[in-house]
């Protein structure tokens, strides 16, 4: 009886269960009753990352410097090239096809997580007791100055964008 289903790493063709080609190789000819599947290695600029019956290998991804991309990991016959973004930029998507500048956190917000080549800056509002008076991709919210430790008193309250203003204590009782 000809098979209707095949084992793992096999495929059914012409009533035969043929071996799939291993990662890094493409299909040249299907197996027959008497011969095994014929596979050939992908060329240097190509890859296949699964057991397959593809007749063409996939081209490695090109990390286009005009889009701010650079090679993070060179592709092999079994893996695609991994691109990342140049410093100051991050990927616009998971597949990292182009890059955009990291965003800055506006005054009143501080950096919760610094951007990487694949993720943007994460900002957080400065909580009570903290402030940020700059637009920055690196600076966290800073704590208000503690006037007491300087033997000073608060003359002007701080906000999420401004520090407290300290002044001398009123000596009049």
């Amino acid at each position: 009886e000809p098979p209707t289903a095949c084992r793992e790493k096999q495929y059914l063709i012409n009533s035969q269960c043929c071996s799939l080609c291993q990662p890094g190789q493409k299909l040249v000819s299907d197996c027959t009753e008497f011969t095994e599947t014929e596979c050939l290695p992908c060329s240097e600029s190509e890859f296949l990352d699964t057991w397959n019956r593809e007749t063409r290998c996939h081209q490695h991804k090109y990390c286009d410097p005009n889009l701010g991309l650079q090679v993070q990991q060179k592709g092999t016959s079994e893996t695609d090239t991994i691109c990342t973004c140049e410093e100051g930029l991050h990927c616009t998507s998971e597949s990292c096809e182009s890059c955009v500048p990291h965003r800055s956190c506006l005054p009143g917000f501080g950096v919760k997580q610094i951007a990487t080549g694949v993720s943007d800056t994460i900002c957080e509002p400065c909580p009570v007791g903290f402030f940020s008076n700059v637009s920055s991709a690196f600076e966290k919210c800073r704590p208000w100055t503690s006037c007491e430790t300087k033997d000073l008193v608060v003359q002007q309250a701080g906000t999420n964008k401004t520090d407290v203003v300290c002044g001398p204590q009123d000596r009049q009782r």
Epitope: E1, C31, T32, F34, T35, E36, E38
Partner: antibody, heavy 123, light 107 residues
């Protein structure tokens, strides 16, 4: 011991018929593809045809030179392979060998041969 | 059909000689190449299958190599019992075809 023994050869007139037999022993006959190969006097080897095993429905394949004239069959209960030869021609004169066809997709080959039986087609 | 061309058709050699027989296919047979030995009045005997795999019981002086269309049978040190005719056979595509044979004779 694995063995193949052919019989049934002889002298036959052009246009005549002959049936060759091959008795197999020492292996599970129905598991194997079985083949006929012939050799004209002083010449090389020529594949005649084969019959598939039980798993592949006992179907047959033939060389173009004998297709439509020769029929391969088998009787698994008797562990015997047959070659029915009709419309015989002078060029069919040869020693006929029964051979077991074995192997996997990493290479198939004739691994067991009979001693051969001579068929002479002449008037 | 795939044509198999063997060379030489015959050769003379002495005991202890290294002997090489070649077989050329009319198209790529992807290593599906077998070698048989036949002595006068006897049936052929399988020596090597799938280019280089020796059948059980075949002495190690017999070896096979090749790829694509060109294949070789080598007898590293010819013994008296090796004087015979050798045939190659392709097993890639029906109909199975044999080379014309190489007769190894005593010098």
């Amino acid at each position: 011991e694995v063995q193949l023994v052919e019989s049934g050869g002889g002298l036959v007139q052009p246009g005549g018929s002959l049936r060759l037999s091959c008795a197999a022993s020492g292996f599970t006959f129905s598991d194997y593809y079985m083949s006929w190969v012939r050799q004209a006097p002083g010449k090389g080897l020529e594949w005649v045809g084969f019959i598939r095993n039980k798993a592949n429905g006992y179907t047959t394949e033939y060389a173009a030179s004998v297709k439509g004239r020769f029929t391969i069959s088998r009787d698994n209960s008797k562990n015997t392979l047959y070659l029915q030869m009709n419309s015989l021609r002078a060029e069919d004169t040869a020693v006929y060998y029964c051979a077991r066809y074995g192997g996997l997709r990493q290479g198939w080959y004739f691994d067991v041969w009979g001693q051969g039986t001579l068929v002479t087609v002449s008037s | 059909d795939i044509q198999m061309t063997q060379s030489p058709s015959s050769l003379s050699a002495s005991v202890g000689d290294r002997v090489t027989i070649t077989c050329r296919a009319s198209q790529d047979i992807r290593n599906y190449l077998n070698w048989y030995q036949q002595k006068p009045g006897k049936a052929p005997k399988l020596l090597i299958y799938y280019t280089s795999r020796r059948d059980s019981g075949v002495p190690s002086r017999f070896s096979g190599s090749g790829s694509g269309t060109d294949y070789t049978l080598t007898i590293s040190s010819l013994q008296p019992e090796d004087f015979a005719t050798y045939f190659c056979q392709q097993g890639k595509t029906l109909p199975w075809t044999f080379g014309g044979g190489t007769k190894v004779e005593i010098k």
